[in-house]
C-alpha cells in the first residue's frame, strides 16, 4: 500500500541503492519514487550533520522484506517512497529554497529580477534541471540578481552549500509549465546521433519515450525494433543529449524509430508508468514471486501490489497452468526495465503500474513519528 | 481572497470553480477535488439553488477568463448535503458533489488529500486560502485564482471574537490579528490547505466570517478532519468499494 | 421557508416613540446583516438604517439618525428598530429586509427577502 | 452620499412590449446596482443583484447590465404580471434606492 508517513531523527541503516544531494526531504522521497529499486530514504538536512561531504544527503534504499532498521540520529528524516501512492505521484516540484546554493555545471548566467523570474527561465531553457539566484542582498555587488542556469549527470546538485543570499530550486518542466513545447511526433526508421546518456530494453518506442521523458539528461532517443538486423541490439532503447538540444543529425535506418522527450511539453506529460500488455512476449529479469493467478490483467495487478515488482509475465504454457490458473512471473531488474525481451513465447508481458497517477487515494494521511 | 496574489498553473490542482447558469453564468463558489467524480464544498452553496442540472464544475483552471463555451465543464450527478446542516443554522457546512463523469487527473487537475479523523494533533504552520473571490469587501470577482497565506487561529481565540456565534469543534479559524488577508465574497467551498511535511491537505472549507479581512474577525471555515466519517461514508461506491482508500 | 415578519407599527404622535420588531425563520438570521426600510406615502424606497450579523456595526440614513436605533437579538431571531422623537415624515410603510451574510458564497448585495411591512403613522 | 436617479418616472406599455429602464449613480458604483419589483400592498421583490444576476426564480426576460454610473433594466417581453414600479438600489455605500419607475398598461 501507500506508506506516507516520515520519521524524524531517524536513519534506515543498510540497503543503499544510490545517494545524491537534495536540498528537502521531499525533493529526496521524490527522488526515491521515480528510481526503479528505492523503498525507502533517509535525508540528512544541514543542521543534522558535521561532515560537510554528507550534509543534504539523500540515500536511497532497498530491502526485500520492503523494511530497515532505523537507528536515531538527531535531525534526520526517513520515509518511503510513493511508489503506489497514485495521484501523489509526480516530479514537480516547486519549491524555492532559500539561503542554499545547488552547485552544478553553470551553462547559462543572466542578470533577472526575481527568484521567480530565475525559476521560469530555468523552465523554459531544454538544458536547465536545476538554477540558483543571488538575490539583490547578495555580499558580491558584481553577482546580485544573477541567474545560474544548471545540470547535472544525474539530474540532482553536485554539491549544496548553506549560502545567504542565494536561492535555489528546479525546473518546473516536470509541472507541465515550460513554453518550449514538445515534438510528440515518432519519426519511423530514423536513428539520431548524438551522445548516448543510457541504455535500456523496452518493448516498444512508446515505452522508450516516456523513460526517456523521466530520465534527468534525455532529450531524444532512438530504439531498435525486434527485427533489427544486429540480434544483440534488438528492443534497445538509446537516451541521448546533445549540446544544441537537438539532435545535430540523423540518418534513415531501416528498423529504428527515434523522437524526443515529451518533459518540456505544455499543459500535459505522459504518466510515468506503463499500461499496455505485450502478447507473445517474455520480459526477462530477476525472480521476484511465481504465483498462479487467473488472467493476464490479474498477474498486472499482482506485479502492481507487490512494490518491488517491475515488470512481469504471464506463462500460457501448459506445464504453467493448473485448471484456469496460470504462472505469473513477478520480475525486477537494476534499471527497472527488461534485462531480456523474447519473442513468440505462449504468454505476455507488461510492466507494473506503481508509478501510475489515476489511484484515487484522497485519504493521503501523513503520520509523523519521532523517535 | 482580500491581500492575496496571482496564482501560476498547477499550483493548487485540485481547485475548481462552481458555476451557475441560469441567462448568463457566473462564478458562485469554489470547491476540492477529492477524487476522481468527487469535490468537496460548502453547503451554503446550494441554499435556495440545490437543482443539479444549472451548475457547471470547472477543473484544471487558473483564470475564468479563458472559460468560452467551448471550455469543458463537469455536470452534477448528485449533491449531497450534510444531514444536519440546516439553513437556519450556521453549522456543519458540507457538501459533496458527485460528478456526472470521472475527471482524469493531471498536474493541473488532481486531488488534494484529506485529512486523518478527527485531526488535532498535527500543527500546522503554513496553510493557505484559495478562491476568485473578491478581493475586498465592495470587490468582484477576480479572472485569476488568489492564494493567501493564512495563519490559523485557536478555536478559543476565534470564539472570543465571535461571541455571537458558536465555534465549535467543527470548525477552524484563520486570520491575522490585524486583518488585511482573508478569504471574501466567492471563495464559499474553496479550499484552506496546510503544507505538512511536504504534502499538502484540505484542513478547512471556507465558510463565512463578518465582512471580509477586518481587523480581529477572522474567516471561520468548516473543519475537515471532524467530517471524516462522513465523507469517506458518502464517498463509498454502490458495490461498497471506497471511492478514496486510506493508505495503510 | 424563508420567511420575516413584522410588528409593533401605529399611530403615534409627533414626539413619540414605538419600537418595531421584525421575526425571521428559515434561515442562519445571525449570519445575516438586516436592513429597515421604509416607503411613505406616495413615495419611493427609502433606506433606513442596517445592521450587522453580530450587531457590532449599525449604520443609519441621514434623515433618522440621533433618533432612531436598531438592534438585534440572534437568540431570538428578531430584529428591531427603536423610533424616538417622530415626525410627520416618519410616516410610512417599514419593511424588515435581509441583505448579505456573512457566508462567503457569491449571492450578495441585494435585499433578498423582505417582509410585508407595518405601516407607521405620526400624526397629533 | 450617492444619489440615484431612475427613469422615466413612469411609462405606459402594452404586453409583448421591450421595456428599458435606466438609472444613473451620482458616482461610480462599480457594479453595485440592484433591481426591484414592488406592487402595492406587497413585499418588494429582488430581480437583478449586481448589475446583471438574475436573482434566483426570476423569469429570463427580465436583464441588467452596466457598470459606475450608467444601468439598464430590460423587459423583454412584457407580460400581464409586470405591472409595477421598479426601483433601483445601489449598494457600492451604505444604501440608496432611485426614485422608482411605475410601469402601467396603455
Known amino acids: 500500500g501507500c506508506l506516507t508517513q516520515l520519521y524524524e531523527n531517524a536513519f534506515f541503516r543498510g540497503g543503499d541503492v544510490a545517494s545524491m544531494y537534495t536540498p528537502n526531504a521531499q525533493y529526496c522521497q521524490m527522488r526515491c519514487t521515480f528510481h526503479p529499486r528505492c523503498l525507502l530514504f533517509s535525508f540528512l538536512p544541514a543542521s543534522s550533520i558535521n561532515d560537510m561531504e554528507k550534509r543534504f544527503g539523500c540515500f536511497l534504499k532497498d530491502s526485500v522484506t520492503g523494511t530497515l532498521p532505523k537507528v536515531h540520529r538527531t535531525g534526520a528524516v526517513s520515509g518511503h517512497s510513493l511508489k503506489q501512492c497514485g495521484h501523489q505521484i509526480s516530479a514537480c516540484h516547486r519549491d524555492i529554497y532559500k539561503g542554499v546554493d545547488m552547485r552544478g555545471v553553470n551553462f547559462n548566467v543572466s542578470k533577472v529580477s526575481s527568484v521567480e523570474e530565475c525559476q521560469k527561465r530555468c523552465t523554459s531553457n531544454i538544458r536547465c534541471q536545476f538554477f540558483s539566484y543571488a538575490t539583490q542582498t547578495f555580499h558580491k555587488a558584481e553577482y546580485r540578481n544573477n541567474c545560474l542556469l544548471k545540470y547535472s549527470p544525474g539530474g540532482t546538485p553536485t554539491a549544496i552549500k548553506v549560502l545567504s543570499n542565494v536561492e535555489s530550486g528546479f525546473s518546473l518542466k516536470p509541472c507541465a509549465l515550460s513554453e518550449i513545447g514538445c515534438h510528440m511526433n515518432i519519426f519511423q526508421h530514423l536513428a539520431f546521433s548524438d551522445v548516448d546518456v543510457a541504455r535500456v530494453l523496452t518493448p516498444d518506442a512508446f515505452v522508450c519515450r516516456t523513460i526517456c521523458t523521466y530520465h534527468p539528461n534525455c532529450l531524444f532517443f532512438t530504439f531498435y525494433t525486434n527485427v533489427w538486423k544486429i540480434e544483440s541490439q534488438r528492443n534497445v532503447c538509446l537516451l541521448k543529449t546533445s549540446e544544441s538540444g537537438t539532435p545535430s543529425s540523423s540518418t534513415p535506418q531501416e528498423n529504428t524509430i527515434s523522437g524526443y522527450s515529451l518533459l518540456t511539453c505544455k499543459r500535459t506529460l505522459p504518466e510515468p508508468c506503463h499500461s499496455k500488455i505485450y502478447p507473445g512476449v517474455d520480459f526477462g529479469g530477476e525472480e521476484l514471486n511465481v504465483t498462479f493467478v487467473k488472467g493476464v490483467n490479474v498477474c498486472q495487478e499482482t506485479c502492481t501490489k507487490m512494490i518491488r515488482c517491475q515488470f512481469f509475465t504471464y506463462s500460457l504454457l501448459p506445464e504453467d497452468c493448473k485448471e484456469e490458473k496460470c504462472k505469473c512471473f513477478l520480475r525486477l531488474s537494476m534499471d527497472g526495465s527488461p534485462t531480456r525481451i523474447a519473442y513468440g513465447t505462449q504468454g505476455s508481458s507488461g510492466y507494473s503500474l506503481r508509478l501510475c497517477n489515476t489511484g484515487d487515494n484522497s485519504v493521503c494521511t501523513t503520520k509523523t513519528s519521532t523517535r | 481572497i482580500v491581500g492575496g496574489t496571482n496564482s501560476s498553473w498547477g499550483e493548487w490542482p485540485w481547485q475548481v470553480s462552481l458555476q451557475v447558469k441560469l441567462t448568463a453564468q457566473r462564478h458562485l463558489c469554489g470547491g476540492s477535488l477529492i477524487g476522481h467524480q468527487w469535490v468537496l464544498t460548502a453547503a451554503h452553496c446550494f441554499d435556495g439553488l440545490p437543482l443539479q442540472d444549472v451548475w457547471r464544475i470547472y477543473s484544471g483552471i487558473l483564470n475564468l477568463s479563458d472559460i468560452t463555451k467551448d471550455t469543458p465543464f463537469s455536470q452534477i450527478k448528485e449533491i449531497i448535503i450534510h444531514q444536519n446542516y440546516k439553513v437556519s443554522e450556521g453549522n456543519h457546512d458540507i457538501a459533496l458533489i458527485k460528478l456526472q463523469a470521472p475527471l482524469n487527473y493531471t498536474e493541473f487537475q488532481k486531488p488534494i488529500c484529506l485529512p486523518s479523523k478527527g485531526d488535532t494533533s498535527t500543527i500546522y504552520t503554513n496553510c493557505w486560502v484559495t478562491g476568485w473571490g473578491f478581493s475586498k469587501e465592495k470587490g468582484e470577482i477576480q479572472n485569476i485564482l488568489q492564494k493567501v497565506n493564512i495563519p490559523l487561529v485557536t478555536n478559543e481565540e476565534c470564539q472570543k471574537r465571535y461571541q455571537d456565534y458558536k465555534i465549535t469543534q467543527r470548525m477552524v479559524c484563520a486570520g491575522y490579528k490585524e486583518g488585511g488577508k482573508d478569504a471574501c465574497k466567492g471563495d464559499s467551498g474553496g479550499p484552506l490547505v496546510c503544507k505538512h511535511n511536504g504534502m499538502w491537505r484540505l484542513v478547512g472549507i471556507t465558510s463565512w466570517g463578518e465582512g471580509c479581512a477586518r481587523r480581529e474577525q477572522p474567516g471561520v471555515y468548516t473543519k475537515v478532519a471532524e467530517y471524516m466519517d462522513w465523507i469517506l461514508e458518502k464517498t463509498q461506491s454502490s458495490d461498497g468499494k471506497a471511492q478514496m482508500q486510506s493508505p495503510a | 421557508e424563508v420567511q420575516l415578519l413584522e410588528s409593533g407599527g401605529g399611530l403615534v404622535q409627533p414626539g413619540g416613540s414605538l419600537r418595531l420588531s421584525c421575526a425571521a425563520s428559515?434561515?442562519?438570521?445571525?449570519?445575516?446583516?438586516m436592513n429597515w426600510v421604509r416607503q411613505a406615502p406616495g413615495k419611493s424606497l427609502e433606506w433606513v438604517s442596517s445592521?450587522?450579523?453580530?450587531?457590532?456595526?449599525?449604520n443609519y440614513a441621514d434623515s433618522v439618525k440621533g433618533r432612531f436605533t436598531i438592534s438585534r437579538d440572534n437568540s431570538k431571531n428578531t430584529l428591531y428598530l427603536q423610533m424616538n422623537s417622530l415626525r410627520a415624515e416618519d410616516t410610512a410603510v417599514y419593511y424588515c429586509?435581509?441583505?448579505?451574510?456573512?457566508?462567503?458564497?457569491?449571492?450578495?448585495?441585494?435585499?433578498?427577502?423582505w417582509g410585508l411591512g407595518t405601516m407607521v403613522t405620526v400624526s397629533s | 452620499d450617492i444619489q440615484m436617479t431612475q427613469s422615466p418616472s413612469s411609462l405606459s406599455a402594452s404586453v409583448g412590449d421591450r421595456v428599458t429602464i435606466t438609472c444613473r449613480a451620482s458616482?461610480?458604483?462599480?457594479?453595485?446596482l440592484n433591481w426591484y419589483q414592488h406592487k402595492p400592498g406587497k413585499a418588494p421583490k429582488l430581480l437583478i443583484y449586481?448589475?446583471?444576476n438574475l436573482q434566483f426564480g426570476v423569469p429570463s426576460r427580465f436583464s441588467g447590465s452596466g457598470y459606475g454610473t450608467d444601468f439598464t433594466l430590460t423587459i423583454s417581453s412584457l407580460q400581464p404580471e409586470d405591472f409595477a414600479t421598479y426601483h433601483c438600489?445601489?449598494?457600492?455605500?451604505?444604501?440608496?434606492f432611485g426614485g422608482g419607475t411605475k410601469v402601467e398598461i396603455k
Open positions: 458616482q461610480s458604483i462599480s457594479v453595485y
Open positions: 445592521i450587522s450579523p453580530s450587531g457590532g456595526e449599525t
Open positions: 429586509a435581509r441583505g448579505g451574510g456573512a457566508y462567503r458564497n457569491n449571492w450578495w448585495g441585494g435585499f433578498d427577502i
Open positions: 438600489q445601489q449598494t457600492f455605500s451604505l444604501f440608496t
Open positions: 449586481g448589475a446583471s
Open positions: 428559515g434561515f442562519t438570521f445571525s449570519f445575516y446583516n
